[in-house]
């Protein structure tokens, strides 16, 4: 039975040009994390795995950095990179949980004066 | 060169016992995920058991669960499938096949052994 | 457990032609997907892993997409030897499920 649970950052915002850090945490459970993939809209952008440490899709080598942890930074962001992004974690014996996090990339002007939220 | 050769397959009765054997070669076995996939008469592949790199972690489908073992013995690059209370569904060709890192899925098959559960 | 529904279940179709395979799955499954090809007699082999990676060996006019829940592999310019059968195979949760599998065979 899966009792677990994800906590990420829920809603967060971040300038243009800036950098992100997107944080998930699995609790509740024993299970083993044997993988973490990110993965935004229909991409995977990064895996992280027990054994065999961070792969970063090609496509995502130059804007994306491992960790910290679990976690994933993006860089140089665009206001392109807005959207909802995903952390998959492949676990046993309870098998498959994911969280969500949006990000809203402002221009920034509009983020020094904008209100900044986060969701625990 | 990957290599994977099963071996073992046989006609046994419902409710018999029956363990097949893969040898890899050409790659290093301690290093990948391994799995046991079954075709059925009518070409339906079905996955059968899982085992990660270290043989610490198992998974396997309802149909089979509490009847199938996966194992390995990475000193002899050999993986194992003990299957025990057959049955006439259990009849196929059962392949072992290597998990590319990373991604679960399966990169290199071995050739099949078949398997024929029948009074 | 998640449920795989390919289509079609065949197709006849002739050299030269663009041919379009496609997997539904009963719930998000990310990019946790892999395309196979098996020809008669033979072994499967992987195609397409991670949804969109053509894997290595595969020739390029194979390519695997995703919108949501649906993921396609497409066959652009049919050879005679791509003729045989394609599945798709989840990886998600505990249970690593295939789908139907389509048989394309020439016209």
């Known amino acids: 039975m899966m009792t677990g649970t994800i906590e990420t950052t829920g809603n967060i915002s971040a300038e243009k040009g800036g950098s992100i850090i997107l944080q998930c945490h699995l609790s509740s459970t024993t299970a083993q994390v044997t993988q973490v993939n990110w993965e935004q809209q229909d991409q995977l952008l990064a895996i992280c795995n027990a054994d065999l440490g961070w792969h970063i899709s090609p496509s995502f080598k130059d804007r994306v950095a491992p960790g910290p942890g679990l976690g994933l930074t993006l860089q140089s962001l665009t206001v392109n990179d807005t959207g909802e992004y995903f952390c998959i974690y492949h676990t046993y014996p309870d098998g498959t949980y994911t969280g969500r996090i949006f990000l809203e990339v402002l221009e920034s002007s509009v983020a020094e004066h904008g209100a900044r939220f986060q969701i625990p | 060169e990957v290599q994977l050769v099963e071996s073992g397959g046989d006609l046994v009765k419902p409710g018999g016992s029956l363990k097949l054997s893969c040898a890899a070669s050409?790659?290093?076995?301690?290093?990948?995920?391994m799995s046991w996939v079954r075709q059925t008469p009518d070409k339906r592949l079905e996955w059968v058991a899982i085992i990660s790199s270290g043989g610490n972690y198992t998974y396997y489908p309802d149909s089979v669960k509490g009847r199938f073992t996966i194992s390995r013995d990475n000193a002899k690059n050999t993986l194992y499938l003990q299957m025990s209370s057959l049955k006439s569904e259990d009849t196929a060709m059962y392949y072992c096949?290597?998990?590319?890192?990373?991604?679960?899925?399966?990169?290199?098959w071995g050739q099949g052994t078949s398997v024929t559960v029948s009074s | 457990d998640i449920q795989m529904t390919q289509s079609p279940a065949s197709l006849s179709v002739s050299v030269g032609e663009t041919v379009t395979i496609t997997c539904r799955a009963s719930e998000n499954i990310y990019s946790n997907l892999a395309w196979y090809q098996q020809k008669q007699g033979k072994s499967p082999q992987l195609l397409v892993y991670?949804?969109?990676n053509l894997a290595d060996g595969a020739p390029s006019r194979f390519s695997g997409s995703r919108s949501g829940t649906q993921y396609s592999l497409k066959i652009n310019s049919l050879q005679s030897e791509d003729f045989g059968s394609y599945y798709c195979q989840h990886f998600w949760g505990t249970a690593y499920t295939f789908g139907g599998g389509t048989k394309l065979e020439i016209k």
């Open positions: 096949a290597r998990q590319i890192h990373y991604f679960f899925a399966m990169d290199y």
């Open positions: 991670a949804a969109t």
């Open positions: 050409g790659f290093t076995f301690s290093s990948y995920g």
